[in-house]
Interface confidence: low
């Protein structure tokens, strides 16, 4: 675990650098996703460990404001508060070493346990790929920032210019829960394993070679599409929400977040000095600035708030976690002092619950959410926010419960919707999914424009057999979520050819092709050999792809990489498949044997990425019963021939055959992608 | 299926090294993160270490720390536990366990403790 | 973290409902699990997270609790349900195992 060495990465990663900041992090990471607006940056901070504790100052009535406060009494809300603070998280205990006597913080640290660690990506990625990335999948304008909601100079101003101080929501088009994708980007997927399909496996980058420095022109662009099967999220501020609504954006304009209470009005001078420095970008001046406003003004919100967004700033300048564990602690601070606006208060603990999730505290990020709503608990959009919230840690049914309780309140609540679809459809209720997926979109609530959803309502729609399925992907590709009706891929690089099906001088692999029809009777009997000696090194199809059926895999070589254990059981065919670097270097595929047995149907679903060609050299093929089709082309294998498609292209197989059905999978490279994109582009 | 197999365990002399080892089978070994428990005769379980899926970092037990030695082969699909000086207070019953994981869509690490575990090996310590 | 569990034997007839406790020595929120150890066997996990059932685990087992105490329950004991019960926390390293609870038959 030990932590991302900033100063190792710093200045590797340019070339990612999606948002301008100068360097690789995570916002970048949003943006090649799709996820996140090309814009503001904030710190690239994997997780470390938990907050330190600060206990509350005594807690004393709030004075009420008389705009945009939640309907509750605010003395409800600093009582709640009290509660809830001292109720903290063991993430905010001030813990010791492990061998003291209360050992070191686990849960925001253990991430480390699975594949999916944010510390593993940040220390080894490849600064190849391009900020160029851009993705048909999301056009985002532009992020807020964590202080575009609150200019000072003008939101202090709570009067000189009446537009000035709006928060800036109405242009906004950041998807709901899609703000930072911490853990997403590179990973190698705990969840799936993908079989002919087939899912995403994600893994980190591995480290180029030190001598090969990348210029501005080796640029790579990846687009890469929203969908990612599984994926970790943030949930934006509520003022990044767009609305196209006319009245609502006039409802907007006219609410000016109050974050002065009495005492800051008299102190404005001071606070507008002070915030000048943090907008000029003299952050460590600012932060100066504001930790003396504290020490003369300990009750003052706004100082306080201040000095947060100082601290948050710092911690994205010098990318350090513990710079910005501070900031997120210093954001709590706000939400204990007494008489804090409830604007205020809803703005600091928004940040705290979005900078949690930055530095992957999932289940601490829930709980300052949880505090959220208890403390607007008719702000509808916190009740969405808390619903991702618990999606992010994995606790399906609690989001399904929110979601539900939203929807009995505000039933055309487009977001809601869609995120109920999405679970119901987790939850294999597929037919029960639909129309809460379709109404979602349709609604065209912020948020629900969003790449997966269309994937889901699709998938949904091909699997109940309504043919509107395809409505709903041309929908999506017109809105920017696909390549095209048919190529739903996600993982894309621009440009490359794009057409379902290929012939071998096509590819310009004709060797490779050559080799594996000659020797298909090798490959053939080594993998028979391994379903009669060690069929347990078969693994079964485990992504929901199959109708019905028994459908399992053999693989030897994944992300790029070889597999001892499985070579053993072939290892002619594994030493023959060496000579070809197309396919062993392939970090975006597999080498597999494939057994389909009969009565198997797997639904037409789509590949991960464009930049793989999938080969499948027939090897035990019944005479009839089974055959593929990618996009609107149906084939059938041959023993001792190699069929050739790209798999970004939606495809379906039938198995009816009275005998088993074994084929050899083998990817490669798209022809395309040069050899210094093939070295730089993130394994799958 | 899923399956854990500890090695042979075995009678050592205290201050001697001994290696455990844990067969995995069934599902994607390097995809998952992976732990040692023990259990001395009669008493409760201790947890003892834990391993990243990529082997690059671990965590141990106050009791064993500076003496145990966590690594996997995912090449083989291999746990390993290599222990060193032992004590009589480390004879038990070992047991290697997976870090089972959530396929939940949202969630990529969020993950169910310890959901499958080996059949346990016996170790002890004395001269 | 120091985990207690409380009492260490229960005796209780077949189709009893059977409410364990567990004690943490420091808040874990909901960052614990619940292990079942039969003689001679290997542990099996039952819930994760205070209350989200494992594979395989019967319905008849819950979990409930939060921060520093928790109560799992059987609502009747069936004959197989006669173990060592272990409570677990991974809110801090390093993890830890409570002392155990074996319900045994009355």
């Known amino acids: 675990f030990d932590l991302v060495d900033y100063e190792e990465v710093l200045g590797k990663l340019g070339i990612y650098d999606a948002d301008g900041d100068g360097d690789f992090d995570v916002d970048d990471a949003k943006v090649l996703l799709g996820l996140k607006e090309r814009s503001t940056s904030e710190p690239a901070v994997p997780p470390e460990e938990a907050e330190p504790h600060t206990e509350p100052e005594e807690q004393v009535p709030v004075e009420a404001e008389p705009q945009n406060i939640e309907d509750e009494a605010k003395e409800q809300i600093q009582s709640l508060l009290h509660e809830m603070v001292h109720a903290e998280h063991v993430e905010g205990e001030d813990l010791q070493q492990e061998d003291g006597p209360t050992g070191e913080p686990q849960q925001e640290d253990d991430e480390f346990l699975m594949a999916t660690d944010v510390d593993d990506r940040f220390e080894t990625l490849e600064p190849e790929v391009s900020h160029e990335e851009t993705e048909h999948s999301y056009h985002v304008e532009e992020t807020v920032s964590q202080d575009c909601n609150q200019d000072m100079e003008e939101m202090m101003s709570e009067q000189e210019n009446p537009d000035s101080s709006e928060p800036v929501v109405e242009d906004e088009r950041l998807h709901h829960d899609t703000d930072d994708v911490t853990y997403q980007v590179y990973e190698e997927q705990a969840v799936y394993e993908p079989l002919e399909n087939e899912g995403i496996e994600i893994t980190e980058v591995t480290a180029p070679p030190e001598d090969n420095p990348v210029e501005d022109s080796q640029v790579i662009v990846e687009e890469v599409s929203i969908f990612p099967v599984e994926e970790q999220q943030e949930v934006p501020p509520e003022t990044n929400r767009k609305t196209d609504d006319p009245e609502q954006k006039a409802k907007v304009k006219k609410k000016k977040p109050k974050l002065l209470n009495k005492f800051d009005k008299t102190i404005k001078a001071e606070l507008d000095a002070a915030e000048k420095l943090r907008k000029r970008g003299k952050i460590e001046e600012a932060v100066n600035a504001f930790k003396e406003l504290v020490r003369k003004y300990p009750q003052s919100p706004r100082a306080r708030y201040g000095k947060a967004q100082c601290e948050d700033d710092l911690a994205e300048k010098r990318r350090s976690n513990e710079v910005l564990r501070g900031a997120i602690e210093t954001y709590q601070e706000v939400a204990s002092l007494p008489d804090v606006p409830a604007d205020l208060l809803k703005l600091s603990l928004k940040r705290r619950s979005d900078r949690q999730q930055f530095l992957g505290h999932m289940r601490g990020s829930l709980l300052t959410l949880q505090r959220l709503v208890q403390l607007f608990p008719n702000d509808t959009s916190l009740k969405n926010d808390l619903g991702v919230g618990y999606l992010l840690i994995g606790d399906n049914d609690n989001a399904k419960k929110v979601y539900e309780e939203v929807l009995s309140v505000t039933p055309n609540d487009g977001f809601a919707k869609v995120h109920y679809g999405f679970i119901l459809k987790a939850q294999n209720k597929i037919a029960e999914s639909i129309p809460y997926l379709k109404e979602g979109i349709e609604s065209g609530d912020p948020g629900t424009d969003d790449g997966r959803f269309y994937f889901h309502l699709g998938d949904a729609m091909q699997r109940v057999g309504n043919k509107e399925a395809y409505k709903w992907y041309e929908l999506g590709h017109k809105r920017g979520h696909f390549a095209s009706v048919w190529q739903r891929s996600l993982y894309n690089v621009n440009g490359l050819k794009a057409q379902p099906w290929w012939t071998p001088k096509e590819t310009g692999y004709t060797e490779l092709v050559k080799s594996l029809e000659r020797n298909w009777k090798l490959i053939r009997d080594e993998g028979l050999a391994v379903m009669d000696k060690a069929k347990g090194l078969f693994l079964p199809e485990d992504e929901n792809l199959r109708e019905k059926g028994d459908w399992s895999q053999f693989t030897l070589w994944q992300q790029g990489r070889r597999n001892e254990n499985a070579c053993k059981g072939a290892p002619k065919t594994c030493t023959l498949l060496e000579k070809f670097p197309e396919t062993t270097g392939c970090r975006r595929g597999q080498i597999k044997y494939s057994i389909m047995h009969p009565g198997t149907h797997v639904w037409p679903h789509t590949g991960p990425t464009n930049c793989r060609l999938r080969m499948h050299l027939g090897l035990v093929i019944p005479k009839e019963g089974c055959k593929i089709r990618c996009a609107n082309e149906t084939k059938t294998w041959e023993e001792g021939k190699v069929l050739i498609f790209d798999d970004s292209f939606e495809h379906e197989v039938w198995q009816d055959a009275s005998s088993f059905r074994l084929i050899f999978i083998v990817d490669v490279w798209h022809p395309e992608l040069t050899p210094q994109q093939r070295r730089s582009l993130p394994a799958i | 299926q899923v399956q854990l197999v500890e090695s042979e365990g075995g009678v050592v002399q205290p201050g001697r090294p001994l290696r455990l080892s844990c067969a995995a089978s069934?599902?994607?070994?390097?995809?998952?993160?992976m732990h040692w428990v023990r259990q001395a005769p009669g008493k409760g379980l201790e947890w003892v270490a834990v391993?990243?899926?990529?082997?690059?970092?671990?965590r141990y037990a106050g009791s064993v720390k500076g003496r145990f030695t966590i690594s996997r082969d995912n090449s083989k699909n291999t746990l390993y536990l290599q222990m060193n000086s032992l004590r009589p207070e480390d004879t038990g019953v070992y047991y290697c366990?997976?870090?089972?994981?959530?396929?939940?869509?949202?969630?990529?690490?969020?993950?169910?403790?310890?959901?499958?575990w080996g059949q346990g090996t016996t170790v002890t310590v004395s001269s | 973290i120091v985990l207690t569990q409380s009492p260490a034997t229960l005796s209780l007839p077949p189709r009893e409902r059977v409410t364990l406790s567990c004690g943490t020595s420091?808040?874990?929120?909901?960052?614990l699990a619940w292990y079942q150890q039969k003689p001679g066997r290997a542990p099996r996990v039952l819930t994760y997270?205070?209350?989200n059932k494992a594979a395989g685990t019967p319905a008849r087992f819950s979990g409930s609790g939060s921060e520093t105490d928790f109560t799992p329950a059987i609502s009747s004991l069936e004959p197989e349900d006669f173990a060592v019960y272990y409570c677990?926390?991974?809110?801090?390293?390093?993890?830890a195992f409570s002392p155990g609870t074996k319900v045994d038959i009355k």
């Open positions: 366990a997976r870090v089972g994981r959530s396929s939940n869509w949202f969630s990529r690490y969020y993950y169910y403790d310890m959901d499958v």
């Open positions: 069934g599902f994607a070994f390097s995809s998952h993160a």
């Open positions: 391993i990243s899926h990529d082997g690059s970092r671990d």
């Open positions: 420091q808040n874990v929120s909901h960052h």
């Open positions: 997270d205070v209350a």
């Open positions: 677990q926390q991974r809110s801090n390293w390093p993890q």
